[in-house]
C-alpha cells in the first residue's frame, strides 16, 4: 500500500513536468530506494541542480525567458566548483549569458534568483566589467585567462546556460 501511494505520487509529479520535459533521467540518491533525483533529458546534473546549454542565439531578456518556459533561470554561479563543472560543456569559441545583470548601469550587479551578489565569489576576466552600457554578463574563454566573465550589451545575441533545481520524486 505504501509503495502504491508512493508510485501514484511520483507519477503525478512526473506529469507536472511532462509539458516541457517529456523525458527525465533519474538517479537513486543515497542508499534509499525511495529517493530519486531527476534532471530533464538531456540536461546535465551537478550537486542539487540541472544545467542546459542553449545554443540558440538570443538577447539576455529572451535567453532568460527561454529558460523560464522550461522551469529554469539563467545560471547563477555560486562556487568555483560549479563554474568548473559548467565549463566542461561549453565551446571555447562561444559566449554564454549568465543570470547576472546590472539593469540600471550603476554597477549594482544582481542575480536573476535574487541570490546576493558577492564580490568575493566572482570570476570576471581581468579588467572586467568595464562599460556602463554593458549591463549583462557572459562567460567566455580567453586564451590568456581561460574561462571568465565579461560584461556585454544585453541586446547582442549569445548562447546561454539555464539552471534549475533537481526534481525529487
Amino acid at each position: 500500500n505504501f509503495m502504491y501511494s508512493k508510485t501514484v505520487k511520483r507519477l503525478s509529479k512526473l506529469r507536472e513536468y511532462q509539458q516541457y520535459h517529456p523525458s527525465l533521467t533519474c538517479v537513486m540518491e543515497g542508499k534509499d530506494i525511495e529517493d530519486w533525483s531527476c534532471c530533464p533529458t538531456p540536461w546535465t546534473s551537478f550537486q542539487s541542480s540541472c544545467y542546459f546549454i542553449s545554443t540558440g542565439m538570443q538577447s539576455w531578456t529572451k535567453s532568460q525567458k527561454n529558460c523560464s518556459v522550461m522551469g529554469a533561470d539563467l545560471v547563477v554561479i555560486n562556487t568555483r566548483e560549479e563554474q568548473d563543472f559548467i565549463i566542461q560543456n561549453l565551446k571555447r569559441n562561444s559566449s554564454y549569458f549568465l543570470g547576472l545583470s546590472d539593469p540600471g548601469g550603476r554597477r549594482h550587479w544582481q542575480w536573476v534568483d535574487q541570490t546576493p551578489y558577492n564580490e568575493n565569489v566572482t570570476f570576471w576576466h581581468s579588467g572586467e566589467p568595464n562599460n556602463l552600457d554593458e549591463r549583462c554578463a557572459i562567460i567566455n574563454f580567453r586564451s590568456s585567462e581561460e574561462w571568465g566573465w565579461n560584461d556585454i550589451h544585453c541586446h547582442v545575441p549569445q548562447k546561454s546556460i539555464c539552471k534549475m533545481k533537481k526534481i525529487y520524486i
Epitope: 540558440g56 542565439m57 529572451k62 550589451h153 541586446h155
Partner: antibody, heavy 118, light 107 residues
Framework: QVQLVQSGAEVKKPGASVKVSCKAS????????IHWVRQAPGQGLEWMGT????????SYNQKFKGRVTMTRDTSTSTVYMELSSLRSEDTAVYYC???????????WGQGTLVTVSS | DIQMTQSPSSLSASVGDRVTITCRAS??????LAWYQQKPGKAPKLLLY???TLADGVPSRFSGSGSGTDYTLTISSLQPEDFATYYC?????????FGGGTKVEIK
Amino acid sequence: QVQLVQSGAEVKKPGASVKVSCKASGYTFTSYIIHWVRQAPGQGLEWMGTIYPGAGDTSYNQKFKGRVTMTRDTSTSTVYMELSSLRSEDTAVYYCARMGDNEYFDYWGQGTLVTVSS
Amino acid sequence: DIQMTQSPSSLSASVGDRVTITCRASGNIHNYLAWYQQKPGKAPKLLLYDAETLADGVPSRFSGSGSGTDYTLTISSLQPEDFATYYCQHFWSTPYTFGGGTKVEIK
C-alpha cells in the same frame, strides 16, 4: 533627432567586395546596437546581422557567415558592413537599423543600392 | 531557424475597409513580433512591437494581436496613406526572419 545616414549606391563586379557605411547621429552611438537588413529588388526583407558599436561584438546570420564583416569607427559614429565574394543575387538595397530599448528596430537608414553585374 | 509565413501576399481594399493580415511562425516566438509598413523606395517603418504595442506616432487604427505562433495586424478603417506593403518580423532568436510581405492595393 536620431538619424542614420548611409553611403551612396555602388556597382560591383561578381567576386568583388562592397563596404557600405551607416553614420549615426542624435544619440549616444555606443549605447545601441545596429543591425543590417537587405532587400532584393521586388523582394522581401532579410536580416544579415548585428554589431554593438561599443566593443565591436557581432552576431551574423549563418547564411552570410564568412562573407559578411561588420565593423565600427567610434570616432566618427559610423558602422560598416562589408560583403565579399559578391554574386548577382546580392543585388539589393542594404539598410542599417538601430535596435531601440524595446529590442525592436526603431530607426532605419535610407538604404544603399548595391548592384552586382558583370 | 524560425520561418515566418505571412498571408495574404496581396489584397485589394477600399478606403474605410477593415483589413486583416496574418503571420504564422514555425515555432513559439512568445509575442516578440514587430509589424512594419514600407512604401516604394523607402525604408520600413515600425508600426507595432511585442505583437500589440503601438510604436510612437502610429495611428490607433492599427492594432495587433496574437500569441504563440499566430499573429494578426488589423487596420480598422483603411486610409489613403495606408496603401503600402506590410511585413512581420520575429525577434525571438537569430536569425530575426521577416514574413514575405503583404501588399495592400487600392480596389
